[in-house]
Interface confidence: low
Amino acid sequence: LQDPCSNCPAGTFCDNNRNQICSPCPPNSFSSAGGQRTCDICRQCKGVFRTRKECSSTSNAECDCTPGFHCLGAGCSMCEQDCKQGQELTKKGCKDCCFGTFNDQKRGICRPWTNCSLDGKSVLVNGTKERDVVCGPSPADLSPGASSVTPPAPAREPGHSPQ
């Protein structure tokens, strides 16, 4: 015997209280697949969340974040504060990147400058809090008398302490 509920399309639920007839989802609820015995409550985009897509009878609402914040997690489950370029978000708020690190985005953490010497290259342009160093040709490729910029100090890393 076929389950009568399997005939209920998305946007409805199989109402056990009404002889398993297909009833439309109540307001602020949805069912995204057929054969559902209940409808799911629509997500509410409140506070720092704002509505990107309204809830319908067949699909949940989608949220994004208000200006100054960005989404984190599956389906934008969290909003994280934006920082400025050259900063990273810590549990105490936005903090400037330590010397030897940079962040060119409004999110994420500060990353160490590229160590040009590992690739046998010289530093063409010094790094800043907002930008990585630019590596140039290897010192051997430079013409005689050409001076190269001093490579940056290593970035602060767990287990390392700047003196």
């Epitope: 969290m78 994280e80 810590t90 105490k92 953490i109 767990p158 700047p162 003196q163």
Partner: antibody
Amino acid sequence: EVQLLESGGGLVQPGGSLRLSCAASGFTFSSYDMSWVRQAPGKGLEWVSDIDPTGSKTDYADSVKGRFTISRDNSKNTLYLQMNSLRAEDTAVYYCARDLMVYGFDYWGQGTLVTVSS
Amino acid sequence: EIVLTQSPGTLSLSPGERATLSCRASQSVSSSYLAWYQQKPGQAPRLLIYGASSRATGIPDRFSGSGSGTDFTLTISRLEPEDFAVYYCQQSYSYPVTFGQGTKVEIK
């Protein structure tokens, strides 16, 4: 070599006070956030409090808020934890740790035991 | 408060075996803010992994971290005798800073 050395622990009666110190060496103390983390006997780790490099911004676990005060003296490279109105549940080994914020706690002291008992 | 739940509570393994430790967060945590520590009896914790997957200075490459969102894993590829200890995960994404309850890795 980075070193953190706690002192000031001991036996105290409920309702009493104690001040813990953490002497730091081997790094630029005034550049780092610092934290206190405690561990009750046979239990897990519990963050207690932290302080920013200048000493102007502090935060506390709810369990100690209003009773404990974190402070620092950058001229002495020392971190402090003033503990008032102590309770039996404050009994623990107290560790000071260098706090890299995003990156966790990269250096820890050896800990000092605080026992609150009558 | 972000609650971190570690499993299993105890892991009984032999040297040379692979250990897989889990840490589940009660809400999404940016992987940049998740760390793992090792603690041996009578010693202070030691930072192993930061940013969910980056090894701290001096940590052997048999230790690796992975995961994102709410599920994080610490893997010890081949257990050495000195690896038998308690392991804690920790988040510094939001206050209060929280630790998991720990996983004890013991010799079988």
